[in-house]
């Protein structure tokens, strides 16, 4: 009922609390001696659903019937209106509109640990609109039944706070949930476990990886479990992997050996718990354990390539690279490389520990045959010494293979494609395609790149360490027992018309004609590899086209004659540079008047 | 000193009905266990019913008695009831209320005379046929 009603009654008929669809009867009465002071007839009563006027009767009571309420909570009051008066409110009343519940479904109970406590979760429903209390009863051995009540508006958990204990893990408890409201009753079917079926264990604890001398191939991990365990399941990865490697083990006692891990790769590990072969479920699995293991010595070898380059008539500059080895390979942090220079004839032999770097550079004499051991080590070992004989590598002019070509593949890459060379193409055992930025000067501090090439292959895709717009210099070498042939070949993979022209820095005269010289264009403004340089001339003032003069780019030319000027005319002169992508803009203008002969 | 002190008990009708109390002094058992247990002539005290004192309190009930009887308790008060429907003349026994010192979590120790370490003096039920 609503306010203290003092003037009269609302009564709902047949209850205040009925199922979706059901008629209620409403009435209002007005209490002796409380209706309009001067004509009671004049009383007229209201009825209001909420605040919307629904009904009204002039007297000392109203009926009425009310249909097609809404699930949910409705409010009705009644007033009275007297004339020349604002409405005074009578009394009112609630009804609330449900459904009787449904049977609640998929009870399941669990215990999470041995210590933990029994709770229950199901599935309630469709919504009552009304107070509905649940009760969950659990029956078990003993003559025993425990039951606790939910009085929550949306319950479908509850925890029963008690602990079953596994003196007979196989004795049955049988769980039931009871949903009750004021339209009726129901109850889920029986849920029948035992203390096997429902306890959970909880994921073990204290996880410890142990490598018995420090060796990856005895390994063992440990941890511990709730007392009852049986079964375990393991799972690990190497920490950059997504797929994990799962075992099974029974009866593991808190330590399991693990015989198939790699050398120095953090892995990760989770360990999950049963109690039964077949009954019940498995824990969470634990919290991870993140572990390095041991190094292994290196296993594989390196990579190793070499270049030579001519001092002067005794001397040699020998520059050595190897590429890093696989983390597979290396099995560990590599500490240092090994290099050994030896003369084969002499026996002489030096040995070096390289830090840092992935090359060495030495001089050695011009004479003897000279040969490289390149290892690298870690701190448990290094791996085998690769072994080259320096010879020359271009030598063998028959061996050279023929018609390289470099093209353009795609984004940062590049097509290397050659012919066997005219020697017996069946005397090449390998051939290694080598590239560097090309660099005026020739600068030996470039780094060097080569990939190696099976003795069938006639063409290599290169695509490390390659950049648009710069040019490469390519050379193909065929390897064959101690000789080696070359080819070389300019390439890049993108290229576009160069951003500057040739600075000229001089002009001089010779003999009659005169002798143009410039300095390179900065490798970041010639966009891709050089074809030509174009050489301008025209009579100053004149407004005729200039003559030009094309000649090929090569790498160390930064000077060319010109003899076709007349003496005693000023010219005006200047350069460009070309790609296969086009013409770059003019490099700056020079005047010259050849002076010719004197007369 | 703590005491417990058991009321309500009588004679009745089979089918009858009965509101035992148990109203707890000297320290407050609001949040531990309380049970009840009777004791027949020339019989061993056997458990009727509890409360676990764990989260919100779970009732429990030996099965011969599931249905019929009801553990409620006011913590407030201190008092503790066993609301009895529908008796038989198997329920005549002398009512024993028992209040612990701790929560009981574990299966079947609420049903345990040892769990319990303060009991009352006793009310007579008799239930005539």
């Known amino acids: 009922k609503i306010d203290a009603c003092k003037r009269g009654d609302v009564t709902v008929k047949p209850s205040h609390v009925i199922l979706l669809g059901s008629t209620v009867n409403i009435t209002c009465s007005l209490k002796p001696r409380q209706g309009c002071f001067h004509y009671s007839r004049r009383n007229k009563l209201i009825l209001y659903k909420f605040d919307r006027r629904i009904n009204f009767h002039h007297g000392h009571s109203l009926n009425s019937q009310v249909t097609g309420l809404p699930l949910g909570t409705t409010l009705f009051v009644c007033k009275l209106a007297c004339i020349n008066s604002d409405e005074i409110q009578i009394c009112g009343a609630e009804i609330f509109v449900g459904v009787a519940p449904e049977q609640p479904q998929n009870l399941s109970c669990i215990q999470k640990g041995e210590q933990g406590t029994v709770a229950c979760t199901w599935e309630r429903g469709r919504d009552t609109h009304l107070y509905t209390e649940y009760t969950l009863q659990l029956s078990g051995p003993k003559n025993l039944t425990w039951q606790k009540q939910c009085k929550d508006i949306y319950c479908d958990y509850l925890d029963f706070g008690i602990n079953l204990t596994p003196e007979s893990p196989e004795s049955n408890f049988t769980a039931k949930v009871t949903a009750v409201n004021s339209l009726g009753s129901s109850s889920s079917l029986p849920s029948t476990f035992t203390f096997l079926d429902i306890v959970r264990p909880l994921p073990p604890w204290d996880i410890r990886i142990k490598f018995q001398k420090a060796s990856v191939s005895r390994c063992t991990l440990y941890w511990r479990d709730e007392g009852l365990v049986l079964l375990n399941r393991l799972r690990y990865r190497p920490s950059n992997s997504r797929l994990w490697n799962m075992v099974n083990v029974t009866k593991a006692k808190g330590r399991h050996d693990l015989l198939d891990l790699k050398p120095f790769t953090e892995y990760e590990f989770q360990i999950s718990s049963k109690l039964h072969l077949y009954k019940g479920s498995w824990s969470d699995w634990s919290e991870s354990l993140r572990a390095q293991t041991p190094e292994e010595e290196p296993t594989g070898m390196l990579d190793v390539w070499y270049m030579k380059r001519h001092i002067d008539y005794s001397r040699q500059q020998i520059s050595l690279f190897w590429k890093n080895l696989s983390v597979s390979e290396a099995r560990g942090k590599i500490l240092h490389y090994q290099v050994t220079l030896q003369e084969l004839t002499g026996g002489k032999a030096m040995t070096q520990n390289i830090t840092g770097h992935t090359s060495w550079t030495t001089v050695i004499p011009r004479t003897g045959n000279w040969a490289v051991a390149v290892s690298a080590a870690n701190s448990k070992g290094s791996s085998l010494p690769t072994r080259i004989n320096i010879m020359n590598l271009c030598e063998a002019g028959l061996l050279a293979p023929r018609q390289v070509s470099a093209n353009s593949e795609g984004m940062d890459n590049i097509l290397v494609t050659w012919q066997p060379p005219r020697k017996d193409p069946s005397a090449v055992q390998e051939y290694v395609v080598e590239w560097r930025e090309l660099h005026p000067g020739g600068d030996t501090q470039v780094p060097l790149n080569w990939l190696r090439s099976r003795p069938y292959n006639v063409s290599a895709l290169i695509s490390e360490n390659i950049k648009s717009y710069i040019c490469y210099e390519i050379r193909v070498y065929a390897l064959s027992g101690d000789q080696g042939g070359c080819s070389s070949i300019l390439g890049n993979s993108k290229h576009k018309a160069p951003l500057s022209g040739p600075h000229i820095n001089a002009i001089t005269e010779e003999k009659g004609s005169i002798l143009i010289s410039w300095n390179s264009i900065p490798v970041q403004e010639q966009m891709g590899c050089l074809l030509h340089y174009r050489i301008y001339w025209k009579e100053r003032d004149s407004n005729s086209q200039p003559q030009l003069c094309e000649i090929p780019y090569r790498v160390s030319q930064n000077s060319h004659p010109i003899n076709s000027l007349q003496p005693r005319v000023t010219y005006v002169l200047w350069m460009t540079a070309l790609t296969a992508a086009g013409e770059s803009s003019h490099g700056n203008e020079r005047e010259f008047c050849l002076q010719g002969k004197a007369n | 000193q703590v005491q417990l002190q058991e009321s309500g008990g009588g004679l009745v009708q089979d089918g009858g009905s009965l509101r035992l109390s148990c109203a707890a002094s000297?320290?407050?058992?609001?949040?531990?266990?309380m049970a009840w247990f009777r004791q027949a002539p020339g019989t061993e005290r056997e458990f009727v019913a509890g409360?676990?004192?764990?989260?919100?309190?779970?009732?429990f009930y030996d099965n011969s008695v599931m249905g019929r009887f009801t553990i409620s308790r006011d913590s407030a008060k201190n008092t503790m009831w066993l609301q009895i429907n529908n008796l038989k003349p198997e329920d005549t026994a002398v009512y024993y209320c028992?209040?612990?010192?701790?929560?009981?979590?574990?299966?079947?120790?609420?049903?345990?005379?040892?769990?319990?370490?303060?009991w009352g003096q006793g009310t007579q039920v008799t239930v005539s046929s």
């Open positions: 409360l676990s004192g764990s989260g919100g309190d779970t009732a």
């Open positions: 028992a209040a612990a010192t701790h929560v009981v979590v574990s299966y079947g120790l609420v049903r345990k005379r040892g769990t319990y370490d303060y």
């Open positions: 000297g320290r407050t058992f609001s949040n531990y266990a």
